[in-house]
Interface confidence: low
């Protein structure tokens, strides 16, 4: 018996062009939820085959509404783990299917609409009781980051959770770090690998990376004698000497991280975040120094007096990152206003402004019509950063300087004759046709083919079109 656990870290647009901006359709806000399906074995199974090892559904995530101008973010996720309990043996090899579903919250007839957004399938080998396995998978244009593990529950042990281990109160002939198992009480079960350095005599673990102490011992590796301890409310198998256990300290007690590293607890273990220049499980190894020249792009390296001390890169303008290895994309902040084009020249930013705008950031809106006279009685119309002339009849062109012959385009249909007029043009229609452009035939019975007569006029009434 045991449980498979899945933790979704992030779901969002993958890298590269064409990444979607929003998981929601145009119909409005939506929220995400996940479904996990476990199938035994590594074979390529049909998508419809049952989730023989179990399945689970997450809660709904927070409502997401797309911000039109904002960059596409990692999307808000449901809280908590997805847990798939299994009653029988853990198979070791399995197929993991994670589906990301969208619940649309627009005005749907009959309630919310669900649609499958992404589906990833991983065929994996995984022993129960092991550490969290991290993974990143792409599904189309989406990227999913997640961790998973299988752990035994109750008294089950082993990589398949098939063996039952009964804690015994009597002293055991098993060696240090080994525990007796039932029903085969003369067999010793090898425990998982404890935290490195965990005392074999005074410590034990039930999960990898853990170190819990026997009565009378303390410290992250159970190497420090404890002055006093109580046996009240203790859990875990009894000690062969005193019949009780003290629970081990938290993984970060006493800060196992050297060289100023900060400790954070992880399931059953700890993780050190090391300062610059140090690495290793406990930040115990001094790695990169200024002597290695780790600062790129003209960054200035500053180290301590000790040759093995950490380094800090002071980056020149336009670069960032712990090694000044990343060029700052200063245009990503969209400093150019009014649609100006941003150019990062390295030493400076330059905005190339659209017509009608000026200034270092295109912030000044020029008077589009200032100093722009429209000839021949035309009027200047401002808009969109460029001036436009609305020309008087008979004139055209950008500044109304060109003479326009209104009859040049032969606007009168069906053989009508065109006459240029001070207010435009007039069509003299051939017999049997009417309309401002002679476009409508007049029927022999006097009823025109106009789709609808203007108010106050009946089809067939004489009409004058200018």
């Amino acid at each position: 018996a045991g449980v498979f656990e899945l933790q979704i870290h992030s779901f969002g647009p993958g890298p590269g062009p064409g990444a979607p901006r929003s998981p929601c359709s145009a119909r409005g806000p939506c929220r995400l939820f996940f479904r996990v399906c476990l199938k035994p074995g590594l074979s390529e199974e049909a998508a419809e085959s049952p989730c023989a090892l179990g399945a689970a559904l997450s809660a709904r995530g927070p409502v997401y509404t797309e911000q039109p101008e904002a960059p596409a973010p990692d999307l808000p996720l449901p809280n908590g783990l997805l847990q798939v309990p299994f009653r029988d043996a853990w198979p070791g090899t399995f197929s993991l299917i994670i589906e990301t579903w969208r619940e649309e919250l627009g005005d749907q007839i009959g309630g919310p609409a669900w649609s499958l957004l992404a589906r990833v399938t991983r065929r994996r080998r995984l022993a129960a009781g092991g550490p969290w396995a991290r993974d990143i998978q792409r599904a189309g244009a989406w990227e999913l980051r997640f961790s998973y593990r299988a752990r035994c529950e109750l008294l089950a042990v082993g990589t398949a959770c098939t063996r039952l281990c009964r804690p015994r109160s009597a002293p055991s002939r098993c060696g240090p770090g080994l525990r007796p198992c039932a029903p085969l009480e003369d067999e010793c079960e090898a425990p998982p690998v404890c935290r490195a350095g965990c005392s074999l005599e005074h410590g034990f673990c039930e999960q990898p990376g853990e170190c819990r102490c026997l009565e009378g011992w303390t410290g992250p590796l159970c190497t420090v004698p404890a002055s006093t301890s109580s046996c009240l409310g203790l859990r875990g198998p009894s000690s062969a000497t005193t019949g009780c256990l003290v629970p081990g300290p938290g993984p970060c007690d006493g800060n196992p991280c050297a060289n100023g590293g900060s400790c954070s607890e992880t399931p059953g273990s700890f993780e050190c975040t090391c300062p610059r220049g140090f690495y290793g499980l406990r930040c115990e190894v001094s790695g990169v120094t200024c002597a290695d020249g780790p600062c790129f792009n003209g960054g200035l390296c500053v180290g301590g007096a000790d040759p093995d001390s950490a380094y800090i890169c002071h980056c020149p303008p336009g670069f960032q990152g712990s090694n000044c290895e990343k060029r700052v994309d200063r245009c990503s902040l969209q400093p150019c206003r009014n649609g100006g084009l941003c150019l990062d020249l390295g030493h400076a930013l330059r905005c190339r402004c659209r017509a009608g705008f000026a200034g270092p950031r295109c912030e000044h809106n020029l008077d589009d019509c200032a100093g722009r006279a429209c000839a021949n009685g035309g009027t200047c119309v401002e808009g969109g950063g460029a001036h436009r002339c609305s020309c008087a009849l008979g004139f055209g062109g950008r500044d109304c300087r060109e003479r326009a012959d209104p009859c040049a385009a032969r606007p009168c249909a069906h053989g009508g004759r065109c006459y240029a007029h001070f207010s435009g043009l007039v069509c003299a229609c051939a017999p049997g046709y009417m309309g401002s452009r002679c476009e409508f035939p007049v029927h022999p019975d006097g009823v025109s083919a106009l789709p609808a007569a203007p108010p106050g006029l009946r089809p067939g009434d004489p009409q004058r079109y200018l």
């Epitope: 890298p15 790129f296 990152g321 712990s322």
Partner: nanobody
């Protein structure tokens, strides 16, 4: 989980060349700063070369001009081209990786042995 697999080590005569490869799985390679360290028997582990996510590299003084570190994001692999090898380059060579948001090299390969005979 993140896995680094090195290859390309071996025995070579002084003045010869080798190309070490380090292939990464389980993580987006583009987001990793890659490095090669080496450790000779009885000596401290030392940085040989480091290549940032942008592709620019730094080298230990002892290998400058002879070693070239490059990365092939499409194949999730970092290559250390070693020319003009010297007996003092003999060591176990380890590939290491870290994300570009932290400073500790958290991911390590098993190492590949390079032996340069005179």
């Amino acid at each position: 989980q993140v896995k680094l697999v090195e290859s390309g080590g071996g025995l070579v005569q002084a003045g010869g060349s080798l190309r070490l490869s380090c292939t990464v799985s389980g993580f987006t390679f583009d987001d990793l700063v890659m490095a090669w360290f080496r450790q000779a028997p009885g000596k401290e582990r030392q940085l040989v070369s480091l290549v940032a996510t942008a592709g620019n590299s730094v080298y230990a003084d002892s290998v400058k001009g002879r070693f070239t570190l490059s990365r092939d994001n499409a194949h999730s692999t970092a290559y250390l081209q070693m020319n003009g090898l010297k007996p003092e380059d003999t060591a176990m060579y380890y590939c290491a990786a870290r994300t570009d948001s932290e400073h500790a090299f958290k991911f390590w390969g098993q190492g590949t042995q390079v032996t340069v005979s005179s």
